[in-house]
């Protein structure tokens, strides 16, 4: 399972994705899209 | 301009598997994540997951787990959504698409044509 | 996951009248009072286009007369005064969760 970063600090659970709200602003990944800082 | 560019119509018979492409221009590749979306005819549109041309990691919906794989090449700026064991159920057009993200100063989305797979024996 | 529902299925209204669509969402859509709720347009033979995204936001190069409003789990996507170039399905999507989810679409047509 994947991690991905997020800067609003949720989680989804079902997916076991866990979304952290340090290093957004660094942009070290692809853009998700339709959320907030998401980038994996 | 940021464009999309999938694949031509395949015709598969059940049991088979397709592989369609999707070739990104116009933006950095690996800056934002390749989503896949289906539409069975006449129906109602379905997320199948997304992709990172940046890390190569992949996020499907359950639903196809273990038939769909998706992945990218960047040296061609492509990336691929394969579903495999395909029934009848699976016709419909395939989309790529791009989303920018909440955050950004602007907010649209990106799309490719369209590749419709139809599964027939 | 979380199951997108969609009202009426379809709906015919005057040119110059206005045209509500309803979204329901089988548990709320919100975080840190964000809406993670998005509208789509889709004309026949075209792939979709993101109309309102966050609930309330327009979409880059999207009419005024297309609003969206609502939080948690019901929302509304308003157009204002129905033009015959709106004539399409509109969708309502969410993001907040994988595996992302649509509604069934209402299509809207000229009486």
């Known amino acids: 399972d994947a991690e991905f970063r997020h800067d609003s600090g949720y989680e989804v659970h079902h997916q076991k994705l866990v979304f952290f709200a340090e290093d957004v602003g660094s942009n070290k990944g692809a853009i998700i899209g339709l959320m907030v800082g998401g980038v994996v | 301009q940021v464009q999309l560019v999938q694949s031509g119509a395949e015709v598969k018979k059940p049991g088979a598997s397709v592989k369609v492409s999707c070739k990104a221009s116009?933006?950095?590749?690996?800056?934002?994540?390749i989503h896949w979306v289906r539409q069975a005819p006449g129906q109602g549109l379905e997320w199948m997951g997304f992709?990172?041309?940046?890390?190569?990691?992949?996020n499907y919906n359950q639903k196809f787990k273990g038939r769909v794989t998706m992945t990218r090449d960047t040296s061609t700026s492509t990336v691929y959504m394969e579903l495999s064991s395909l029934r009848s159920e699976d016709t419909a057009v395939y989309y790529c698409?791009?989303?920018?993200?909440?955050?950004?100063?602007?907010?649209?989305?990106?799309w490719g044509q369209g590749t419709l797979v139809t599964v027939s024996s | 996951d979380i199951v997108m529902t969609q009202s009426p299925d379809s709906l015919a209204v005057s040119l110059g009248e206005r045209a509500t669509i309803n979204c329901r969402a089988s548990?709320?859509?919100?975080?840190?009072?964000?809406?993670?709720l998005n509208w789509y347009q889709q004309k026949p033979g075209q792939p979709p286009k993101l109309l309102i995204y966050a609930a309330t936001k327009q979409g880059t190069g999207v009419p005024d007369r297309f609003s969206g409003s609502g939080s948690g789990t019901d929302f509304t996507l308003t157009i204002s005064s129905l033009q015959a170039e709106d004539v399409a399905v509109y969708y309502c999507q969410q993001s907040k969760e994988f595996p992302w989810s649509f509604g069934g679409g209402t299509k809207v047509e000229i009486k």
């Open positions: 992709t990172s041309p940046y890390s190569g990691v992949s």
């Open positions: 116009g933006y950095t590749f690996t800056t934002y994540a």
């Open positions: 548990e709320s859509v919100d975080n840190d009072r964000i809406s993670f």
């Open positions: 698409a791009r989303f920018d993200n909440y955050d950004r100063g602007y907010v649209r989305d990106y």
